[in-house]
Interface confidence: low
Amino acid sequence: QRFAQAQQQLPLESLGWDVAELQLNHTGPQQDPRLYWQGGPALGRSFLHGPELDKGQLRIHRDGIYMVHIQVTLAICSSTTASRHHPTTLAVGICSPASRSISLLRLSFHQGCTIASQRLTPLARGDTLCTNLTGTLLPSRNTDETFFGVQWVRP
Amino acid sequence: QRFAQAQQQLPLESLGWDVAELQLNHTGPQQDPRLYWQGGPALGRSFLHGPELDKGQLRIHRDGIYMVHIQVTLAICSSTTASRHHPTTLAVGICSPASRSISLLRLSFHQGCTIASQRLTPLARGDTLCTNLTGTLLPSRNTDETFFGVQWVRP
Amino acid sequence: QRFAQAQQQLPLESLGWDVAELQLNHTGPQQDPRLYWQGGPALGRSFLHGPELDKGQLRIHRDGIYMVHIQVTLAICSSTTASRHHPTTLAVGICSPASRSISLLRLSFHQGCTIASQRLTPLARGDTLCTNLTGTLLPSRNTDETFFGVQWVRP
């Protein structure tokens, strides 16, 4: 079904255009597999236009279908390190509210030191996205190696 | 902050929609790690709508936040080859103007023969993007294995 | 060339916004390398807004440039398994109409168990996209590990 009658004019406001690109701030303490993110022009090329950060986790402000993308590179890593510390896994999911908790995207490093992927998914206002890195290897904080972002695509 | 008052009508022109998808033309001479790209309907499925090519490098014509994506596959490659020739690294960055030079996205091949990633980043009119492949392995020119593109997302 | 004179108003209808995100339904019979997809709210977080499924393959309904993305994870896989069963390759292409048949995106697994990539490509109404997985390993049907989607980007 079409979103509106042909020729209905589109207010700029309704375009949404919510978008965020974050860089790694730090990892959690021992029992907390979450990555903690930061964003803002003072930090370089990261930004938040619409979504917000809540204790390092990304919270959505506008309902819609989003493109979620992530790249995580392990620090001090070679293919030997990666395989020796296997399984190291990265999962992106909705962690709050608990009623909507679900894993959206999951990858293992196997013999590689970088994972990168993206997917389209419906998100609702108030959804908080968590990125869990399980395993003993450490993520690089270099802003061109580890980043996480979302882009509003359509209602 | 919202981009406009609700109900302000959006001229099609202002949507931007600048977009490009390029295929590999050739690699640089020995001391030049840059990949040289080409695009246009005569070449197949590559295209440039807004951005331009300047000596094989992609130049941005409209300020905004862009989704930058790339896939590079190494030619005549196996996991053994890839690990033996390690480190082979691909970096995408702004190389001109020099004052804005920065690495935007970086990946190593380790034991794999393909890297693929994407990220959101602010780009300005006149920014030229370079893709540097360091190492001794050569990239595949197959259009379904090696490609590079940008998509304007929002102002 | 610009898409319209400045200040031409944009009808919501023309935005397109066709989008789909699919989850794996099943693989084909022995001689059929295609992956068969499914989508819809009843299945979880997959959906089709515009494109349709035709016998498990994705058919495009609106001309334009699309961002095509895919992630496929092999089931019961380790880097040893992956390298032993090499080559395992994933290709996304237009398989119908036959006159437009072309491979759009291709990746090999080498020593990894997941591939993920994305690209911009022009697609036309009626184009059917097929995803071919060659090799003896089976894909995971977990919805956070294997998915395939398209997003209309511009006319």
Epitope: L24, N25, H26, T27, P29, D32, T136, P139 | - | -
Partner: antibody, heavy 122, light 111 residues
Framework: EVQLVQSGAEVKKPGESLKISCKGS????????IGWVRQMPGKGLEWMGI????????KYSPSFQGQVTISADKSISTAYLQWSSLKASDTAMYYC???????????????WGQGTLVTVSS | QSVLTQPPSASGTPGQRVTISCSGS????????VNWYQQLPGTAPKLLIY???QRPSGVPDRFSGSKSGTSASLAISGLRSEDEADYYC????????????FGTGTKLTVL
């Protein structure tokens, strides 16, 4: 069991050099940051700096930058704190502490050494 | 001179609830996670609370942490004589290149 064992107490004269150590056991030493914390007599805790033994990535507090050197030898799971020229004001208890955290996670140290008392007196 | 300010002393009787405050700024407590340490007389510090309010395993639930804006608090309920110790808050300070900063410390006396 995770343990950080520090070298014994030292009595030195001003101007002398000193290197104290902190040896880790019972865990993957190269997966942890090792921080050093000073406690002057009757005073509070002061963070000096931190090192990641795997690649010797080191961060110093601005107050201690240039005053001390932090190093590590991952082959023997040991971190070091050294002075090239001690002062009377360096008299303090020095603790090493480990942080599993991947990155400088705001003063989180889950295991501590027993402390090394350094006395500098003429 | 610490950038995190704590009261020099606090006291309470057994069974009581006491609270120790830690005041900072937007560059430290306001934008980072707060950890609390207990230092019993003559011993090394011990991690008591991390990440504003989380307790490591083995720490009794009598200890709780909270944070609001640029201040953090450590609460100890059901006070016991063995809680007599020095307590320090610690966090990261972004204005000091990400250095860790400790609070001035609070001496808790159980009367």
């Amino acid at each position: 069991e995770v343990q950080l064992v520090q070298s014994g107490a030292e009595v030195k004269k001003p101007g002398e050099s000193l290197k104290i150590s902190c040896k880790g056991s019972g865990y993957g030493f190269t997966s942890y940051w090792i921080g050093w914390v000073r406690q002057m007599p009757g005073k509070g805790l002061e963070w000096m700096g931190i090192i990641h033994p795997d690649d010797s990535d080191t961060k110093y507090s601005p107050s201690f930058q240039g005053q001390v050197t932090i190093s590590a030898d991952k082959s023997i799971s040991t971190a070091y704190l050294q002075w090239s020229s001690l002062k009377a004001s360096d008299t303090a208890m020095y603790y090493c502490a480990s942080s599993y955290l991947r990155g400088l996670w705001g003063g989180y140290f889950d295991y501590w050494g027993q402390g090394t008392l350094v006395t500098v007196s003429s | 001179q610490s950038v995190l300010t704590q009261p020099p002393s606090a006291s309470g009787t057994p069974g009581q609830r006491v609270t120790i405050s830690c005041s900072g700024s937007s560059s430290n407590i306001g934008s980072n996670y707060v950890n609390w340490y207990q230092q019993l007389p003559g011993t090394a510090p011990k991690l008591l609370i991390y990440g504003d309010y989380q307790r490591p395993s083995g720490v009794p639930d009598r200890f709780s942490g909270s944070k609001s804006g640029t201040s953090a608090s450590l609460a100890i309920s059901g006070l016991r004589s063995e809680d007599e110790a020095d307590y320090y808050c610690a966090t990261r300070d972004d204005s000091l290149s990400g250095s860790v900063v400790f609070g001035t410390g609070t001496k808790l006396t159980v009367l």
